[in-house]
Protein backbone atom coordinates (compact mmCIF):
# COMPACT_ATOMS: atom_id res chain seq x y z
CA UNK A 1 0.00 0.00 0.00
CA UNK A 2 1.07 3.61 0.44
CA UNK A 3 1.67 5.06 3.50
CA UNK A 4 1.38 8.70 4.37
CA UNK A 5 2.66 10.77 7.91
CA UNK A 6 2.35 12.24 10.14
CA UNK A 7 -1.78 12.68 10.13
CA UNK A 8 -1.71 16.15 11.75
CA UNK A 9 1.21 18.47 12.06
CA UNK A 10 1.81 21.79 13.00
CA UNK A 11 4.04 24.10 12.14
CA UNK A 12 5.91 26.65 13.75
CA UNK A 13 6.55 30.16 11.62
CA UNK A 14 9.85 30.50 9.71
CA UNK A 15 10.05 26.37 9.80
CA UNK A 16 10.24 23.98 7.36
CA UNK A 17 8.21 20.45 7.98
CA UNK A 18 8.42 17.85 5.71
CA UNK A 19 5.55 15.01 4.98
CA UNK A 20 6.59 11.38 4.57
CA UNK A 21 5.03 9.47 1.50
CA UNK A 22 6.35 5.56 0.82
CA UNK A 23 4.70 2.88 -0.97
CA UNK A 24 5.50 -0.35 -1.22
CA UNK A 25 3.34 -1.14 -4.95
CA UNK A 26 6.50 -0.78 -6.99
CA UNK A 27 4.97 2.40 -8.53
CA UNK A 28 7.18 4.50 -10.62
CA UNK A 29 5.13 7.59 -10.50
CA UNK A 30 4.54 9.63 -6.96
CA UNK A 31 2.08 12.76 -6.52
CA UNK A 32 1.73 15.12 -4.04
CA UNK A 33 -1.54 17.11 -3.61
CA UNK A 34 -3.07 20.18 -1.55
CA UNK A 35 -6.51 20.33 -0.71
CA UNK A 36 -7.44 23.63 0.81
CA UNK A 37 -11.36 23.63 2.49
CA UNK A 38 -13.78 23.72 -0.61
CA UNK A 39 -11.80 23.11 -3.26
CA UNK A 40 -10.54 20.60 -4.95
CA UNK A 41 -6.99 18.58 -5.61
CA UNK A 42 -4.09 21.02 -6.88
CA UNK A 43 -1.21 19.06 -8.14
CA UNK A 44 2.36 20.68 -6.17
CA UNK A 45 5.17 18.28 -7.46
CA UNK A 46 5.06 14.85 -8.97
CA UNK A 47 8.04 12.43 -9.86
CA UNK A 48 8.11 9.56 -12.70
CA UNK A 49 11.24 8.03 -12.41
CA UNK A 50 13.57 8.15 -8.91
CA UNK A 51 15.73 10.72 -9.24
CA UNK A 52 13.57 13.17 -11.35
CA UNK A 53 10.43 15.04 -10.70
CA UNK A 54 8.47 17.71 -12.03
CA UNK A 55 6.86 20.97 -10.29
CA UNK A 56 3.30 20.97 -10.75
CA UNK A 57 0.09 23.80 -10.27
CA UNK A 58 1.41 25.27 -7.47
CA UNK A 59 5.29 23.84 -6.40
CA UNK A 60 6.36 27.82 -5.01
CA UNK A 61 6.85 26.86 -1.24
CA UNK A 62 7.60 23.38 -1.63
CA UNK A 63 10.36 21.42 -2.40
CA UNK A 64 10.68 17.65 -3.07
CA UNK A 65 13.45 14.63 -3.58
CA UNK A 66 13.17 11.39 -5.16
CA UNK A 67 16.11 8.97 -3.26
CA UNK A 68 14.11 5.75 -4.12
CA UNK A 69 11.42 4.23 -5.93
CA UNK A 70 9.64 4.06 -2.77
CA UNK A 71 9.74 7.48 -1.23
CA UNK A 72 9.28 10.74 -2.02
CA UNK A 73 8.91 13.61 1.04
CA UNK A 74 7.55 16.95 0.65
CA UNK A 75 8.86 19.33 2.48
CA UNK A 76 6.70 22.54 3.23
CA UNK A 77 9.32 25.49 3.52
CA UNK A 78 9.36 28.47 5.55
CA UNK A 79 8.38 30.06 2.09
CA UNK A 80 4.88 28.74 1.94
CA UNK A 81 3.35 31.23 3.69
CA UNK A 82 -0.16 29.47 3.55
CA UNK A 83 0.51 25.92 4.55
CA UNK A 84 -2.63 25.16 6.40
CA UNK A 85 -3.91 22.56 3.88
CA UNK A 86 -4.84 19.03 3.53
CA UNK A 87 -1.77 17.23 1.78
CA UNK A 88 -2.06 13.91 -0.37
CA UNK A 89 0.30 11.61 -2.13
CA UNK A 90 -0.81 9.27 -4.39
CA UNK A 91 1.09 7.01 -6.68
CA UNK A 92 0.66 5.00 -9.93
CA UNK A 93 1.95 2.75 -12.47
CA UNK B 1 28.34 16.96 -0.72
CA UNK B 2 28.60 13.50 -2.17
CA UNK B 3 32.55 12.44 -2.57
CA UNK B 4 33.99 9.50 -4.27
CA UNK B 5 37.32 7.85 -4.49
CA UNK B 6 38.36 4.76 -6.16
CA UNK B 7 41.03 2.68 -5.13
CA UNK B 8 42.87 -0.64 -6.35
CA UNK B 9 45.76 -1.93 -8.76
CA UNK B 10 46.76 0.23 -11.68
CA UNK B 11 48.70 -2.86 -13.63
CA UNK B 12 46.63 -5.82 -14.40
CA UNK B 13 48.04 -8.97 -16.32
CA UNK B 14 45.62 -9.97 -19.41
CA UNK B 15 43.29 -12.77 -18.36
CA UNK B 16 42.97 -11.77 -15.32
CA UNK B 17 40.45 -9.81 -13.29
CA UNK B 18 40.31 -6.27 -13.22
CA UNK B 19 38.89 -4.99 -9.20
CA UNK B 20 38.17 -1.79 -8.23
CA UNK B 21 36.84 -0.12 -5.00
CA UNK B 22 34.76 2.94 -4.60
CA UNK B 23 34.86 4.89 -1.32
CA UNK B 24 31.80 7.39 -0.93
CA UNK B 25 31.75 9.91 1.77
CA UNK B 26 29.00 12.35 2.55
CA UNK B 27 26.13 9.87 1.99
CA UNK B 28 25.13 6.76 2.62
CA UNK B 29 24.46 4.10 -0.32
CA UNK B 30 21.58 2.40 0.92
CA UNK B 31 19.56 5.66 0.96
CA UNK B 32 18.94 5.96 -2.79
CA UNK B 33 20.32 6.71 -6.35
CA UNK B 34 22.64 4.71 -8.35
CA UNK B 35 26.23 4.22 -8.55
CA UNK B 36 27.54 3.65 -11.45
CA UNK B 37 30.89 2.89 -13.02
CA UNK B 38 32.14 4.48 -16.59
CA UNK B 39 35.52 4.26 -18.15
CA UNK B 40 37.52 5.99 -20.89
CA UNK B 41 40.26 4.58 -22.72
CA UNK B 42 43.60 7.05 -23.17
CA UNK B 43 42.35 9.79 -25.76
CA UNK B 44 38.79 8.41 -26.07
CA UNK B 45 35.56 8.77 -25.68
CA UNK B 46 33.50 7.26 -22.19
CA UNK B 47 31.71 4.08 -21.69
CA UNK B 48 29.21 3.45 -19.28
CA UNK B 49 29.94 -0.02 -17.15
CA UNK B 50 26.90 -0.19 -15.10
CA UNK B 51 25.38 0.30 -12.07
CA UNK B 52 24.41 -0.74 -8.30
CA UNK B 53 21.23 0.82 -7.07
CA UNK B 54 20.28 2.14 -3.38
CA UNK B 55 18.62 -1.65 -2.83
CA UNK B 56 21.53 -3.64 -4.56
CA UNK B 57 19.92 -4.43 -8.09
CA UNK B 58 22.14 -4.14 -10.65
CA UNK B 59 21.89 -3.09 -14.47
CA UNK B 60 24.83 -3.68 -16.57
CA UNK B 61 26.01 -2.64 -20.21
CA UNK B 62 25.58 -5.63 -22.49
CA UNK B 63 28.87 -5.27 -24.26
CA UNK B 64 30.28 -5.92 -20.96
CA UNK B 65 27.65 -7.97 -18.96
CA UNK B 66 29.43 -11.41 -19.41
CA UNK B 67 32.56 -10.18 -17.82
CA UNK B 68 31.54 -7.17 -15.58
CA UNK B 69 29.93 -7.70 -11.23
CA UNK B 70 29.26 -4.67 -9.33
CA UNK B 71 28.46 -5.30 -5.39
CA UNK B 72 28.53 -3.29 -2.48
CA UNK B 73 29.97 -3.23 1.25
CA UNK B 74 27.33 -1.44 3.01
CA UNK B 75 29.39 -1.58 6.51
CA UNK B 76 31.98 0.12 4.53
CA UNK B 77 29.83 2.40 2.52
CA UNK B 78 31.66 1.02 -0.58
CA UNK B 79 30.71 -0.01 -4.03
CA UNK B 80 33.38 -2.48 -6.05
CA UNK B 81 33.94 -3.33 -9.77
CA UNK B 82 35.38 -6.65 -10.91
CA UNK B 83 36.39 -7.38 -14.80
CA UNK B 84 36.61 -10.63 -15.99
CA UNK B 85 39.50 -12.09 -18.36
CA UNK B 86 40.79 -8.99 -18.95
CA UNK B 87 42.55 -7.96 -22.47
CA UNK B 88 45.07 -4.71 -23.66
CA UNK B 89 40.95 -2.85 -24.80
CA UNK B 90 40.27 -3.12 -21.02
CA UNK B 91 43.02 0.15 -20.25
CA UNK B 92 41.16 2.78 -19.08
CA UNK B 93 40.25 5.51 -16.73
CA UNK B 94 37.64 4.13 -14.47
CA UNK B 95 35.59 6.44 -12.40
CA UNK B 96 33.15 6.01 -9.75
CA UNK B 97 30.16 8.20 -10.06
CA UNK B 98 26.75 9.03 -8.42
CA UNK B 99 23.83 11.08 -10.27
CA UNK B 100 23.31 14.28 -9.06
CA UNK B 101 19.67 15.01 -7.00
CA UNK B 102 17.14 15.83 -9.71
CA UNK B 103 18.12 15.11 -12.87
CA UNK B 104 17.53 11.94 -13.73
CA UNK B 105 20.14 8.96 -14.05
CA UNK B 106 22.82 11.50 -15.46
CA UNK B 107 25.77 11.76 -13.41
CA UNK B 108 27.53 14.53 -11.75
CA UNK B 109 29.71 13.52 -8.54
CA UNK B 110 32.97 11.52 -10.17
CA UNK B 111 35.94 9.91 -8.72
CA UNK B 112 38.99 11.38 -9.85
CA UNK B 113 39.51 8.26 -11.79
CA UNK B 114 42.31 6.26 -11.47
CA UNK B 115 44.21 4.48 -14.72
CA UNK B 116 44.47 0.80 -15.00
CA UNK B 117 46.74 -0.88 -17.46
CA UNK B 118 46.14 -4.22 -18.56
CA UNK B 119 49.44 -5.37 -19.65
CA UNK B 120 52.03 -8.79 -19.48
CA UNK C 1 22.39 0.20 -28.34
CA UNK C 2 21.89 4.35 -28.55
CA UNK C 3 24.49 5.67 -30.89
CA UNK C 4 25.08 9.25 -30.28
CA UNK C 5 26.57 11.26 -32.80
CA UNK C 6 28.16 14.82 -32.44
CA UNK C 7 29.73 17.15 -34.92
CA UNK C 8 31.87 18.55 -35.98
CA UNK C 9 34.41 15.79 -33.84
CA UNK C 10 36.75 19.14 -34.03
CA UNK C 11 36.31 22.86 -34.09
CA UNK C 12 38.45 25.73 -34.08
CA UNK C 13 37.30 28.85 -32.90
CA UNK C 14 38.28 32.13 -31.38
CA UNK C 15 37.27 34.03 -27.08
CA UNK C 16 33.95 35.51 -28.02
CA UNK C 17 32.62 33.57 -30.99
CA UNK C 18 28.97 32.01 -30.92
CA UNK C 19 29.93 28.26 -30.97
CA UNK C 20 26.91 24.94 -31.60
CA UNK C 21 27.83 21.59 -31.32
CA UNK C 22 25.42 19.04 -32.34
CA UNK C 23 24.69 15.48 -31.07
CA UNK C 24 21.97 13.18 -32.76
CA UNK C 25 20.76 9.94 -31.41
CA UNK C 26 19.73 6.85 -33.51
CA UNK C 27 16.24 6.46 -31.19
CA UNK C 28 14.31 8.66 -30.15
CA UNK C 29 15.34 9.95 -26.73
CA UNK C 30 11.57 10.82 -25.27
CA UNK C 31 11.29 8.50 -22.53
CA UNK C 32 8.00 6.50 -21.51
CA UNK C 33 7.09 9.22 -19.35
CA UNK C 34 7.18 11.92 -21.35
CA UNK C 35 10.69 13.19 -20.31
CA UNK C 36 14.15 13.77 -22.63
CA UNK C 37 17.26 12.10 -21.10
CA UNK C 38 19.95 14.08 -23.39
CA UNK C 39 22.95 15.86 -20.97
CA UNK C 40 26.12 17.59 -21.83
CA UNK C 41 29.12 17.38 -20.03
CA UNK C 42 32.66 19.23 -20.24
CA UNK C 43 36.01 17.48 -20.05
CA UNK C 44 39.14 18.75 -19.87
CA UNK C 45 42.52 16.94 -19.93
CA UNK C 46 43.37 14.59 -16.94
CA UNK C 47 40.21 15.77 -15.10
CA UNK C 48 36.86 14.10 -14.67
CA UNK C 49 33.95 15.14 -17.06
CA UNK C 50 32.06 18.07 -15.39
CA UNK C 51 28.45 18.21 -16.04
CA UNK C 52 26.66 21.40 -17.76
CA UNK C 53 23.18 20.59 -19.12
CA UNK C 54 20.55 18.01 -17.79
CA UNK C 55 17.68 16.73 -19.64
CA UNK C 56 18.18 18.79 -23.13
CA UNK C 57 18.01 22.23 -21.70
CA UNK C 58 18.42 22.70 -17.81
CA UNK C 59 21.77 24.42 -16.96
CA UNK C 60 23.11 22.48 -14.12
CA UNK C 61 23.62 24.99 -10.84
CA UNK C 62 27.15 27.05 -11.30
CA UNK C 63 26.95 26.46 -15.09
CA UNK C 64 27.54 30.55 -16.77
CA UNK C 65 24.26 31.29 -19.10
CA UNK C 66 26.55 31.46 -22.03
CA UNK C 67 25.70 27.59 -22.00
CA UNK C 68 22.74 26.62 -23.37
CA UNK C 69 20.66 23.02 -24.42
CA UNK C 70 17.94 22.83 -26.88
CA UNK C 71 16.70 20.27 -29.52
CA UNK C 72 14.41 17.42 -29.14
CA UNK C 73 13.54 13.62 -30.31
CA UNK C 74 17.11 12.87 -32.11
CA UNK C 75 18.42 15.98 -32.62
CA UNK C 76 19.88 18.06 -29.85
CA UNK C 77 22.51 21.31 -29.52
CA UNK C 78 24.67 23.01 -26.90
CA UNK C 79 25.13 26.59 -27.17
CA UNK C 80 28.32 28.96 -25.72
CA UNK C 81 27.06 32.26 -27.04
CA UNK C 82 30.55 33.89 -26.06
CA UNK C 83 33.85 31.50 -25.53
CA UNK C 84 35.16 32.60 -22.39
CA UNK C 85 38.89 30.74 -22.33
CA UNK C 86 38.00 28.09 -19.84
CA UNK C 87 35.59 26.88 -22.60
CA UNK C 88 38.39 24.78 -24.48
CA UNK C 89 37.98 21.53 -24.03
CA UNK C 90 36.11 18.68 -25.07
CA UNK C 91 32.02 18.07 -25.04
CA UNK C 92 30.04 14.89 -24.51
CA UNK C 93 26.22 14.22 -24.90
CA UNK C 94 25.02 11.44 -23.40
CA UNK C 95 21.59 9.60 -22.83
CA UNK C 96 20.16 7.82 -20.38
CA UNK C 97 16.62 7.01 -21.45
CA UNK C 98 17.72 3.32 -22.57
CA UNK C 99 19.95 1.02 -21.29
CA UNK C 100 22.70 1.13 -21.73
CA UNK C 101 23.75 4.28 -21.09
CA UNK C 102 25.66 6.13 -23.70
CA UNK C 103 27.61 8.59 -24.75
CA UNK C 104 28.72 10.66 -28.19
CA UNK C 105 32.61 10.35 -29.37
CA UNK C 106 33.14 14.26 -28.06
CA UNK C 107 33.98 17.37 -29.75
CA UNK C 108 37.12 18.78 -28.92
CA UNK C 109 37.09 22.62 -29.16
CA UNK C 110 40.29 24.20 -29.40
CA UNK C 111 41.61 27.81 -29.87
CA UNK C 112 42.20 29.20 -32.75
Known amino acids: GITQSPKYLFRKEGQNVTLSCEQNLNHDAMYWYRQDPGQGLRLIYYSQIVNDFQKGDIAEGYSVSREKKESFPLTVTSAQKNPTAFYLCASSI | QVQLQESGPGLVKPSETLSLTCTVSGYSITSGYFWNWIRQPPGKGLEWIGY???????NYNPSLKSRVTISRDTSKNQFSLKLSSVTAADTAVYYC?????????????WGQGTLVTVSS | DIQMTQSPSSLSASVGDRVTITCRSS???????????LHWYQQKPGKAPKFLIYKVSNRFSGVPSRFSGSGSGTDFTLTISSLQPEDFATYYCSQSTHVPFTFGQGTKLEIK
Open chain 2, 52 to 58: ISYDGSN
Open chain 3, 27 to 37: QSLVHSNGNTY
Open chain 2, 97 to 109: ASPSPGTGYAVDY
